[in-house]
């Protein structure tokens, strides 16, 4: 048993038929020492007596919020909290595994630049008595310091019958240097209550690793005279790293007709314009990507040919 | 990268098409390494991460461009202590600093270069011939260095008598090669702010 | 010992809003993991949960029903309230408080109020 | 939302034999179903939650079982008292809902 924060605990238990679970003992936080009852859940019936308690968790009944009173007056709580391990594997029930870029990938996180702010996301399909908590470090051993903020409910989509809803939390690196070059990972730590399940989810990365820039600005296209070919020109997004020189892009210049099936056109370039044909009803994208690193591509900014 | 880019114009700063070269060189090489060690510790989430530069060389801070010189995180360990010639240096961009910065990026290559030959002359030795380092690679590093163009001592390769343990030596490959992507993309970055200013 | 009573009128007219009060006594919804939902049972037909309000505030409604439906609390008056707007005949039914615990079933009801929509 | 179907509608069992509900969500609620008794004229009463944790003060006769989708109420000794309605309700997600009921009587 551990405590989770002030009067929360959670009590890890093997999860099998008949498991003998786990002896806890409840210590009544009050000075007194007589005629002291508990009570479970604010139910009226009388577990037991004295300043201790000791019971044997074993299952979700034995979990839940016991109480300590003193002549109907409340002296103080403790919320019990379990935590399921089956055949050696802590349960993952409360988040979906998004499964991408590998099986059991319960958290993604996201970078717009080297600033050392990052976002990170999961999914579950629990709408109630749902609490999330998130810690992170950088390095374990001897963490150095990230802070994130509260996670928010940031999405909520239909997959056939299903909802399923996304929560997000951003993040930022106590003391970074964008130019610095990373040798400990990220650390990020997720606690997930959902009413007395307590599970946990880690995931670890380096920023270097989960940057995505946000698609090119200002996308402009002009027509070149006698000619069907169009200059596209366009900027570093507003929230890329600066200086540009340094923190540099590449690009990928698309031209789509308006068919899916119709073949598309790539160019890929260094420099912030680029020469192609516009055919009629096409539309021209463009995205970019850490010009020396090769993490992932941007969204595309798009514009119609017309 | 997989990825046509246009060459330099060959009136550019002229360590930038050699930077670009070694960081191609070096993303293949590992590249190499990940699939033909499938089954070693290879990938970024397994291997340690060690940089043999460490108290050796100061490149990031050397190299900071000048808009981060106000970021007191990339302020920390700022070395002064460097040869202040080369040739990479156009006479009108000669600064202290930024000889400082093209030195410490020379005496990365060396260490790297050092211990690169070394691990080949043990991968040689593998009955398994299972990989070899890219000589491509290798030549690269030898490239940047002479245009580069500091006077240093050679530092003789390190020769081992006892016979080598293959699968350690692997995983140091892998865990070298990772780094020294991680110090190219800096190099790169480096030049790339160098050529623009 | 805990106990919950609903109270509200009898008999609405279509188009009008109902209002009902849940009091309770035994616990309290001030600092504890509690809630109060509000369900109700058409005669001779199943149960349908309609709203609940936790102890922090956080409130949920039925879709189906949420435009119409507004739940608060006064915890200083161990009450909550459910006001229904634009009721209709087919809202004819008996409302019923129930307590949520922390084990998130319904463990105390009240006894149920029996509201008829009619004009 | 989630769908609970319970079958049978109507169940009549002899007294001292086994009774058993079921109950099937139209998606995992994994063990966030809760089963209730209900009397002619009486509020609902809370028996089992978490799917298989009998409630303070309920008869072991009563149990509960299932996960994800599946869920079964089962009564071992049909008594007279237990002459009711039975009801199953998730609240995995909202909104919470209740299965149309299983009206169970003696034989």
């Known amino acids: 048993i551990w405590e989770l924060k002030k009067d929360v605990y959670v009590v890890e238990l093997d999860w099998y038929p008949d498991a003998p679970g786990e002896m806890v003992v409840l210590t009544c936080d009050t000075p007194e020492e007589d005629g002291i009852t508990w009570t479970l859940d604010q139910s009226s019936e009388v577990l037991g007596s004295g300043k201790t308690l000791t019971i044997q968790v074993k299952e979700f009944g034995d979990a839940g919020q016991y109480t300590c009173h003193k002549g109907g007056e409340v002296l103080s709580h403790s919320l019990l909290l379990l935590h399921k391990k089956e055949d050696g594997i802590w349960s993952t029930d409360i988040l979906k595994d998004q499964k991408e870029p590998k099986n059991k990938t319960f958290l993604r996180c996201e970078a717009k630049n080297y600033s050392g702010r990052f976002t990170c996301w999961w999914l579950t399909t629990i709408s109630t008595d749902l609490t999330f908590s998130v810690k992170s470090s950088r390095g374990s051993s001897d963490p150095q310091g990230v802070t994130c903020g509260a996670a928010t409910l940031s999405a909520e989509r239909v997959r056939g019958d299903n909802k399923e809803y996304e929560y997000s939390v951003e993040c930022q690196e106590d003391s970074a240097c964008p130019a610095a070059e990373e040798s400990l990972p990220i650390e990020v730590m997720v606690d997930a209550v959902h009413k007395l399940k307590y599970e946990n989810y880690t995931s670890s990365f380096f920023i270097r690793d989960i940057i995505k820039p946000d698609p090119p600005k200002n996308l402009q296209l002009k027509p070149l005279k006698n000619s069907r070919q169009v200059e596209v020109s366009w900027e570093y997004p507003d929230t890329w790293s600066t200086p540009h020189s340094y923190f540099s892009l590449t690009f990928c210049v698309q031209v789509q007709g308006k068919s899916k099936r119709e073949k598309k056109d790539r160019v890929f370039t260094d420099k912030t314009s680029a020469t192609v044909i516009c055919r009629k009803n096409a539309s021209i994208s463009v995205r970019a990507q850490d010009r020396y690193y090769s993490s992932s591509w941007s969204e595309w900014a798009s514009v119609p040919c017309s | 990268r997989n990825l046509p880019v246009a060459t330099p114009d060959p009136g550019m700063f002229p360590c930038l098409h050699h930077s670009q070269n070694l960081l191609r060189a070096v993303s293949n090489m590992l590249q190499k390494a990940r699939q033909t060690l499938e089954f070693y510790p290879c990938t970024s989430e397994e291997i340690d991460h060690e940089d043999i530069t460490k108290d050796k060389t100061s490149t990031v801070e050397a190299c900071l461009p000048l808009e981060l010189t106000k970021n007191e995180s990339c302020l920390n360990s700022r070395e002064t202590s460097f040869i202040t010639n080369g040739s990479c240096l156009a006479s009108r961009k000669t600064s202290f600093m930024m000889a400082l910065c093209l030195s410490s990026i020379y005496e990365d290559l060396k260490m790297y270069q050092v211990e690169f030959k070394t691990m080949n002359a043990k991968l040689l030795m593998d009955p398994k011939r299972q990989i070899f380092l890219d000589q491509n690679m290798l030549a690269v590093i030898d490239e940047l260095m002479q245009a580069l163009n500091f006077n240093s001592e050679t530092v003789p390769q390190k020769s081992s008598l006892e016979e080598p343990d293959f699968y350690k030596t692997k995983i140091k490959l892998c865990i070298l090669l990772h780094a020294f992507r991680i110090r190219a993309v800096t190099i790169d970055r480096v030049m790339s702010y160098l050529n623009a200013s | 010992e805990v106990t919950l009573r609903e109270s509200g009128p009898a008999l609405v007219k279509p188009t009008q809003t109902l209002t009902l009060t849940c009091t309770f006594s035994?616990?309290?919804?001030?600092?504890?993991?509690?809630?109060v939902s509000w369900i109700r049972q058409p005669p001779g037909k199943a149960l349908e949960w309609l709203a609940h309000?936790?102890?922090?505030?956080?409130?949920y409604y039925n879709p189906s029903l949420k435009s119409r439906l507004t739940i608060s609390k006064d915890t200083s008056k161990n009450q909550v309230v459910l006001t229904m707007t634009n009721m209709d005949p087919v809202d004819t039914a008996t409302y019923y408080c129930?307590?949520?615990?922390?084990?998130?079933?319904?463990?105390?009801w009240g006894q149920g109020t029996t509201v008829t929509v009619s004009s | 939302d989630v769908v609970m179907t319970q079958s049978p509608d109507s169940l009549a069992v002899s007294l001292g034999e086994r009774a058993t509900i079921n109950c099937k969500a139209s998606q995992s609620v994994s063990n966030d179903v809760a089963w209730y008794q209900q009397k002619p004229g009486q509020p609902p009463k809370l028996l089992i939650y978490?799917?298989?944790n009998r409630y303070t003060g309920v008869p072991d006769r009563f149990s509960g079982s299932g996960y994800g989708t599946d869920f079964t109420l089962t009564i071992s000794s049909l008594q007279a008292e237990d002459v009711a309605v039975y009801y199953c309700?998730?609240?995995?997600?909202?909104?919470?809902?209740f299965g149309g009921g299983t009206k169970v009587e003696i034989k």
């Open positions: 309700q998730q609240d995995y997600n909202s909104p919470w809902t």
């Open positions: 309000i936790y102890w922090d505030d956080d409130k």
């Open positions: 978490y799917a298989s």
């Open positions: 129930t307590r949520r615990g922390i084990r998130s079933a319904m463990d105390y």
């Open positions: 035994g616990f309290s919804l001030s600092k504890s993991v509690m809630g």
